[in-house]
Each structure stands twice: as structure tokens, then as C-alpha cells.
Interface confidence: low
């Protein structure tokens, strides 16, 4: 590409636009697969976040890798492709008309991405139109220097966004979490993920996700009513990738949604929450940045329990302990909260039913000039079985009509000399921010209250 | 800290070629743009191209395709220009300078300045 | 290509001036905007890029602001080896381009 295209809401065109399904669609996966096999898969994971700035834990408390520098190394790592879809791209500060240091480690990112397809690297980039960050120029950036890039028209496809935040690196690593690409995942909001090493079986499978949003990222694309064969998944929550982690025996499958964006094999993200839930015997913590038994972006909205059913039936029918820690900030729907007291107010400790609820404020300090930022915006859950690490907020919409992805990982415990299994490192990482004095109970929440931090 | 060495000058007949050198130092030479400017007596600032030396990717101003060829030896992390079939308009200071974050030309060179002249 | 225009060619001011010289970008260059000072030895460094942010190194009296098609450099406290030409270079759209300089003097 010799020109940084004005921005646009048409077609970038990437340079292999398919003929027809499932051939030539994508951009660089055929020739990775054989030499994939060739190497013998050595996986490992590693749990990362993003704490916002001016956001002090407790002096010696566990935290995962930083998510900055986890998103540079893997850069650095890729030797042949990179392969991102991300709800859209906001990486430089003034994007969103802010000019704050905090933008810096945005920036460097970009410039890494640049300086990787400066070495012939082939970036692909699977995007939402319609998106956020209307007045960012990080695509064009990237497109002239020969990213391929593609707007997949999830509003006309299935009334939903692309919001799915996953990178395949050279078909053999992989990022997934509540991270998108944007400044502010790195410097100012609470974000979790995993980075998977070495894992070309699991790369291999996202990535047919990947393909899913590529092959409809091309224009007058439509959902096909059968996915195609080489689509499919063979690794999904009946058949789970089984292999050593670190040494660590571990099953793992991706997820995705919605429904119509599951090819033949790949299990439904809402089904794998539900399993993971249905799993549990002793506890299911959960933290997302919203919690909603409804629909939130059609109407007129409708009433959709799915999870909060699920969540009563294990604490109810099981004695399985329940905590929800949800994101409170300046932008938070204060309706969530009736439907937060209705969950609590199942609790009753003589009965052994356990369910638990906190907001989760993250201070805005010095940071108000910086919008839609200081959130708790992971999501993920845990139980003593399994982690669950996601993309999706939960209420329908994400599940029925918004692309997402979940991972579910299992570890087995035992002696071994790397530590903790995964489920017990989320855990960890929750119980922190639970115990942290940033986590408010609901009834230290009066009704209509702002989600500001009370010190 | 980084330095771009630049020979001061050079004298050349007019129809004959000139390739000059620009010598990195105090980074990493394969992982950064090199930029290439030209400054005519008294004037504004011409940008040439650029090269990438960690793959030899090349982007080229229309205006210089054919008068400018980019290459690099990464041995010597040195980044070079030749420029062809010289007439007096190629009279100027030439600056090599680093592609920098979000593609600022952070760092210069000193310039080389070449007359072509019988 | 895009034309990048700096009205004024030549500023006078006195030292302990606070200075502002302006580019226009011939269309929407998305805050990828550049400024560079060259010495009268031929000497070129970069000030500010991206708009706002500061070179390491450069002086805080240094500061850029602008958005769309116009910017401008400002130099809070005029110095005596502020003495300079200043040019403005877009890195939106290839090939990259400069404006003609703006050459401060003192009065």
C-alpha cells in the first residue's frame, strides 16, 4: 500500500479476497498448517492484566504478567503472521482528543505493529463496523504499510458488533482476554487475559474462528446456513484439547458466539458457561463488567435468565458458593443494580446458599479527563474444576447476536513443580480483587448511587 | 546513544551516478525506518523514501522513483543511497534520518552535500 | 500528495517571546504532524511529533497543538539558540511531505 487511507467506512481491501467459501479466504493459514506439524507443540499459559495507574494493591499481592508487556513480547515473537480481531482500534492518545502520558504504551504498541510488517510480517486485522473509535487512524496506518484489514458488517449480519479480542501469532500463539485495542486496556482499565505459547493445535482452532469473521469481512458477504468443513472444530467441550502445560496435564477448548458464527464442533459460548457453572461443587466466582438478566441493545428488551438461573440453581440446589463482583464507573447503568439485590437476596447462610455480590470502583483520581475509562472490564470466571476466561459482557445480546470467545481451561492439581494450576492462579487474582478495598458490597451502595469512589 | 554518520560531501560530473552512505549506530539498525531528504540551496525539505533494513521494504516518492535506488548493508548497519543519471538539479544536501514512533524522523544525519558540476 | 503550507517565511521576535508559527495540511491529517528545527549550520532535529508529544531531550518552552488541517508550534520563552528554521512534515498519507519553513529571527 503506498497511501495511509483517509478514513473510511468502506472495504479495505486485503490483497486475497476469497472467490468463494473456504478457498483462498485465508490470509495466511494454509502455509502455516504444514509447518506447524513439522514442530512439536510445547504449550504453555500465562495469566495476564492490566491494572489501571493509581490503583495500589495490598503490598505483596499476587498479579499476573502485565498486559503491555505481554502484547510486546508476543511481537516480538512473530516471525510470519498476526492475525488480531478486536472490537475496533484506539491506540494513540489523541484518537479520542486526550493527550495524557498514559497513551505512551499505546503508542509503542503501533509502532511495534509497524516495525513488524517493516519485516515482512503479514498482519491481519478482523474488525466491527460499525465500530467505536470512529476518529481513529491506526488501520490506515497499518494498511499503508500492507496490513490487510477487514470490517466485518456485524450490524447487518447479525444486529450485533464484532467483539471478539483475540491475536493467532504465526498459527502457534495466541492472546484472548476482555482487552481491546486501545490505549487505555493498557494504562487505564482493569483488563484479564491469557497468553498461550506454543500451542499450535490450540492457534489452529481460534484461528477457524478468525476465518469466520475474515470470509464475512468481504463485501455482500451473508451468513452461510451451513458453515463449510474446513470450518469446523474438533476440539470443543466433549472433545477438549488434552496435552501438557508446563508440564501440567490440561484440557482446553475455545468457545465462540454467536450461535451462527459456530461452524460444525465448536461449542457455543453460553453452552461453556453454563457447562462450567453446571461443573461446579464448591464455588463459582465470577467478575464481569456487567451483569444484566436481559437483553441491552434490542427492543423492546426482554427478560433472559439464562445465567442468573444458573447461577441460583448451583447455589440453591448445590451449595455451591457464589460471588459476582461487577464493574461499577461513571458510565455504569444504575438499572443492573435491581437485578444485582435480586441475586443477593437469595443468600441465606442457615440454609447453606451462598451468593454474594460486590461492585468493583475503580478510583478515578487525576483521570477524569480520560473517557470511558477507570472500569473493571474483565471477564472471566472460576471454579475449582475450571477457568473460564471471555470476551463477553453477560447479558443476551452477547451470546445471541455479538461475536465473542471463551476459553475454558482445566488443570489437573497435583505435585508440580510450576505452581498453582490456572483455575487456582484466577482464583487468586479474584479473591485479591474481592478483598481489595476497591470491591463495595451492594448494601454500602445505596440505590441510584454514582459508581465514585468513596476512599 | 544514536548516531547517523554522513560523509560531508561530494563532487560528481553531470550523467554519472553517486551512491552515499549513512552509518547507524546506537540502536538496533535492522528494527527501524530509514528516511531520505533532500534540501535544495536555500529551500524547504523533499522527502525521497525509505527503507526498512530488517527486510529491505522499500516506499519511494513518485517524484524520485527513478532517480533514487535504497539499500542497506545490515553488516555494517549502514543504509545507502545511490542516485542516477545526475544533472544540477541533483545539487542539494541529502539527510539520511530514522523512522522513529508513529513515523516521525526522530533522529538525523548530518547531510551530505552534492554538487554536480563539470 | 498532500501540500503542507507555513504561511509565515520568516518571524522576528525578541528573546523572552513567546512564539507561534502555523502549518496547514491540504486535507485531514489525523494529528500525524511533525515539527523539526534546523540550525543555520544545517544541523535538523525533531521537536514534537504527533501533534503534541515532545521529543526526548527537546526543551518544554517547545509545545504543538492542532487538529484536522491546521497545527501550530509554540515557543513559550524565546532563547537565543531557538535561532532557527522550523519545519512542519505530515506522516498521514505517503509520500511524506514538509511545508516550506518558517526561518525565526531576533529582532
Known amino acids: 500500500w503506498q497511501v495511509r487511507r483517509p478514513p473510511t467506512w468502506g472495504q479495505v481491501q486485503p490483497k486475497d479476497v476469497p472467490r468463494s467459501w473456504g478457498h483462498g479466504s485465508s490470509p495466511a493459514l494454509e502455509p502455516l498448517e504444514a509447518e506447524v506439524r513439522k514442530q512439536r507443540d510445547s504449550c504453555q499459559l500465562v495469566l495476564v492484566e492490566s491494572i489501571p495507574q493509581d490503583l495500589p494493591f495490598a503490598a505483596g499481592s499476587l498479579s499476573a504478567q502485565p498486559l503491555g508487556q505481554a502484547w510486546l513480547q508476543l511481537l516480538d515473537t512473530a516471525q510470519e503472521s498476526v492475525h488480531v480481531a478486536s472490537y475496533y482500534w484506539s491506540l494513540t492518545g489523541p484518537d479520542i482528543g486526550v493527550n495524557d502520558s498514559s497513551s505512551q504504551l499505546g503508542e509503542a504498541l503501533l509502532q511495534k505493529l509497524q516495525q513488524l510488517l517493516g519485516r515482512n510480517i503479514s498482519l491481519a486485522v478482523a474488525t466491527s463496523s460499525p465500530t467505536l473509535a470512529r476518529k481513529s487512524t491506526d488501520l490506515q496506518v497499518l494498511a499503508a504499510r500492507g496490513a490487510q484489514v477487514r470490517r466485518v458488517p456485524m450490524g447487518r449480519l447479525t444486529r450485533g458488533v464484532l467483539h471478539s479480542k483475540f491475536w493467532v501469532v504465526d498459527g502457534r500463539h495466541i492472546y484472548m482476554g476482555s482487552a481491546n485495542m486501545d490505549w487505555r486496556s493498557l494504562t487505564q482499565v482493569k483488563e484479564l487475559g491469557a497468553v498461550i505459547y506454543n500451542c499450535s493445535h490450540l492457534a489452529q482452532d481460534l484461528e477457524k474462528t478468525f476465518q469466520t469473521y475474515w470470509v464475512l469481512g468481504v463485501p455482500k458477504a451473508v451468513l452461510p446456513k451451513t458453515w463449510p468443513q474446513n470450518f469446523s472444530s474438533h476440539i470443543n467441550r466433549f472433545q477438549p484439547f488434552q496435552g501438557l502445560f508446563d508440564g501440567v496435564p490440561t484440557t482446553a477448548y475455545f468457545s465462540a458466539s454467536p450461535p451462527a458464527l459456530c461452524p460444525q464442533g465448536r461449542t457455543p459460548d453460553l453452552e461453556a458457561l453454563l457447562a462450567v457453572m453446571g461443573s461446579a461443587q464448591e464455588f463459582i466466582y465470577a467478575s464481569v463488567m456487567e451483569y444484566f438478566p436481559t437483553t441491552r441493545f434490542s427492543h423492546p428488551r426482554r427478560y433472559w435468565p439464562v445465567l442468573d438461573n444458573a447461577l441460583r440453581a448451583a447455589a440453591f440446589s448445590k451449595g455451591v458458593r457464589v460471588r459476582l463482583l461487577v464493574s461499577c464507573g461513571l458510565n455504569t447503568d444504575p438499572t443492573m443494580f435491581p437485578y444485582l439485590r435480586s441475586l443477593q437476596a437469595l443468600s441465606n447462610p442457615a440454609a447453606n446458599v451462598s451468593v454474594d455480590v460486590k461492585v468493583f470502583i475503580v478510583p478515578v483520581g487525576n483521570h477524569s479527563n480520560i473517557p470511558f475509562s477507570r472500569v473493571n472490564h474483565s471477564k472471566f470466571m472460576v471454579t475449582e474444576k475450571a477457568a473460564y476466561i471471555g470476551t463477553s459482557n453477560w447479558s443476551e445480546d452477547y451470546f445471541s447476536s455479538t461475536t465473542g470467545v471463551g476459553l475454558v481451561v482445566t488443570q489437573s492439581p497435583g505435585a508440580q513443580p510450576a505452581g498453582a494450576t490456572v483455575q487456582e492462579q484466577l482464583r487468586q487474582l479474584f479473591e485479591r480483587d474481592w478483598s481489595s478495598r476497591y470491591a463495595v458490597g451492594l448494601d454500602g451502595q445505596a440505590p441510584g448511587q454514582d459508581c465514585v469512589w468513596q476512599g | 546513544q544514536v548516531q547517523l554518520q554522513q560523509p560531508g560531501a561530494e563532487l560528481v560530473k553531470p550523467g554519472t551516478s553517486v551512491k552515499m552512505s549513512c552509518k547507524a549506530s546506537g540502536y538496533t539498525f535492522t528494527s527501524y525506518w530509514m528516511h531520505w531528504v533532500k534540501q535544495r540551496p536555500g529551500q524547504g525539505l523533499e522527502w525521497i523514501g525509505d527503507?526498512?533494513?530488517?527486510?529491505?521494504?522499500?516506499n519511494y516518492n513518485e517524484k524520485f522513483k527513478s532517480k533514487a535506488t535504497l539499500t542497506v548493508d545490515t553488516s555494517s548497519s549502514t543504509a545507502y543511497m545511490q542516485l542516477s543519471s545526475l544533472t544540477s538539479e541533483d545539487s542539494a544536501v541529502y539527510y539520511c534520518?530514522?523512522?522513529?514512533?508513529?513515523?516521525?524522523?526522530?533522529?538525523w544525519g548530518q547531510g551530505t552535500s552534492v554538487t554536480v558540476s563539470s | 500528495d498532500i501540500q503542507m503550507t507555513q504561511t509565515t517565511s520568516s518571524l522576528s521576535a525578541s528573546l523572552g517571546d513567546r512564539v507561534t508559527i502555523s502549518c496547514r495540511a491540504s486535507q485531514d491529517i489525523s494529528n500525524y504532524l511533525n515539527w523539526y528545527q534546523q540550525k543555520p549550520d544545517g544541523t535538523v532535529k525533531l521537536l514534537i511529533y504527533y501533534t503534541s508529544r515532545l521529543h526526548s531531550g527537546v526543551p518544554s518552552r517547545f509545545s504543538g497543538s492542532g487538529s484536522g488541517t491546521d497545527y501550530s508550534l509554540t515557543i513559550s520563552n524565546l532563547e537565543q539558540e531557538d535561532i532557527a528554521t522550523y519545519f512542519c512534515?505530515?506522516?498521514?498519507?505517503?509520500?511524506?511531505?514538509f511545508g516550506g519553513g518558517t526561518k525565526l529571527e531576533i529582532k
Open positions: 527503507i526498512y533494513p530488517g527486510s529491505d521494504s522499500t
Open positions: 512534515q505530515q506522516g498521514n498519507t505517503l509520500p511524506w511531505t
Open positions: 534520518a530514522r523512522g522513529g514512533w508513529l513515523d516521525a524522523m526522530d533522529y
